[in-house]
Amino acid sequence: GITIPRNPGCPNSEDKNFPRTVMVNLNIHNRNTNTNPKRSSDYYNRSTSPWNLHRNEDPERYPSVIWEAKCRHLGCINADGNVDYHMNSVPIQQEILVLRREPPHCPNSFRLEKILVSVGCTCVTPIVHHVA
Amino acid sequence: GITIPRNPGCPNSEDKNFPRTVMVNLNIHNRNTNTNPKRSSDYYNRSTSPWNLHRNEDPERYPSVIWEAKCRHLGCINADGNVDYHMNSVPIQQEILVLRREPPHCPNSFRLEKILVSVGCTCVTPIVHHVA
């Protein structure tokens, strides 16, 4: 097929692994400048489905620290401050992209990886299975 | 500090931009094979702080589609199915990494970007400010 001449300002792609390998600039651009001042940092304690945050650390991954939510109770906290087992605390999960150093210990070579993380918990009505 | 001897199989890091620019292999490894079969896909409807999912689309970003949660109510759903305004539905937010082509005309160079996304909603006790 036709190969369009490459713009001279682009990184060299003559690597033997190209096109499976791309160059990624780690100077992260943060689009979160106008984030809501009502930070979600204390929601884990104030929620009716409270959670604890566990530090998942891996020096071979970027970012190396990911916080994982674990729901504190099976049930949800009611108006009296007690656990109501007629409701369920469940984790809200999201798939995120991370970079994993590959081969291990190499300073500037990574692989894209998708991981599922629990971000927080929410209180849901349980699905009740009726036995005939 | 200690310098770990460089793995001889590592890509060359003599690039003038190193260590800001790294090589990334696109053969995405998906660590989510043993995810819980209790998928969170219906929690948005069953939650006491239900939310709608909005498709945030950008063809020049990877991943191109990100789902954003918007809480349906200011309050939370009580046992009678009504909105209780003594409680608050709030979004649980998480910072995620995405890739954006940069410079935009280059075929194999990208930049990491952090964006804040709302993953779901949780029901919290409001912070009440008492006026003296």
Epitope: G1, T3, I4, R6, N7, C10, S13, P19, R20, V22 | L26, N27, I28, E57, P59, E60, R61, Y62, P63, S64, V65, L99, R100, R101, P104, H105, C106, P107, N108, F110
Partner: nanobody, 123 residues
Framework: EVQLVESGGGLVQPGESLRLSCKAS????????LGWFRQAPGKEREGISC????????YYTDSVKGRFTISRDNSKNTVYLQMNSLKTEDTAIYYC????????????????WGQGTQVTVSS
């Protein structure tokens, strides 16, 4: 050898349909966004549609929205362009191109290009 090969072009009357195919060989389309471009005689090349790598989301230029549909089949390493309600102004050489990860409005961002297939719409 790495290549993209288009097929399915031809001569049709206004209002008729055509389905273009673009088959990749020598590389996998898994991590590529696939774009369709066209160039009419004496005109600039224009991007008309693109389908993303991550979730197969489709994008179209205004002139073909509602008439053209882009789709992909990674198992066949092929991208398609279904063209309905064709107009005389759709006459052009149609090219498919592959860009890593994301669509782009810049031609230079596309790594691979096909040789093109002629579409002529005439009564």
């Amino acid at each position: 050898e790495v290549q993209l090969v288009e097929s399915g072009g031809g001569l049709v009357q206004p209002g008729e349909s055509l389905r273009l195919s673009c088959k990749a060989s020598g590389f996998s389309l898994d991590y590529y966004a696939l774009g369709w471009f066209r160039q009419a005689p004496g005109k600039e090349r224009e991007g008309i549609s693109c389908i993303t790598s991550s979730d197969a989301s489709a994008y179209y230029t205004d002139s073909v929205k509602g008439r053209f549909t882009i789709s992909r089949d990674n198992s066949k390493n092929t991208v398609y362009l279904q063209m309905n309600s064709l107009k005389t102004e759709d006459t052009a050489i149609y090219y498919c191109a592959a860009a890593l990860l994301t669509c782009s409005s810049y031609y230079d961002a596309y790594t691979y290009w096909g040789q093109g297939t002629q579409v002529t719409v005439s009564s």
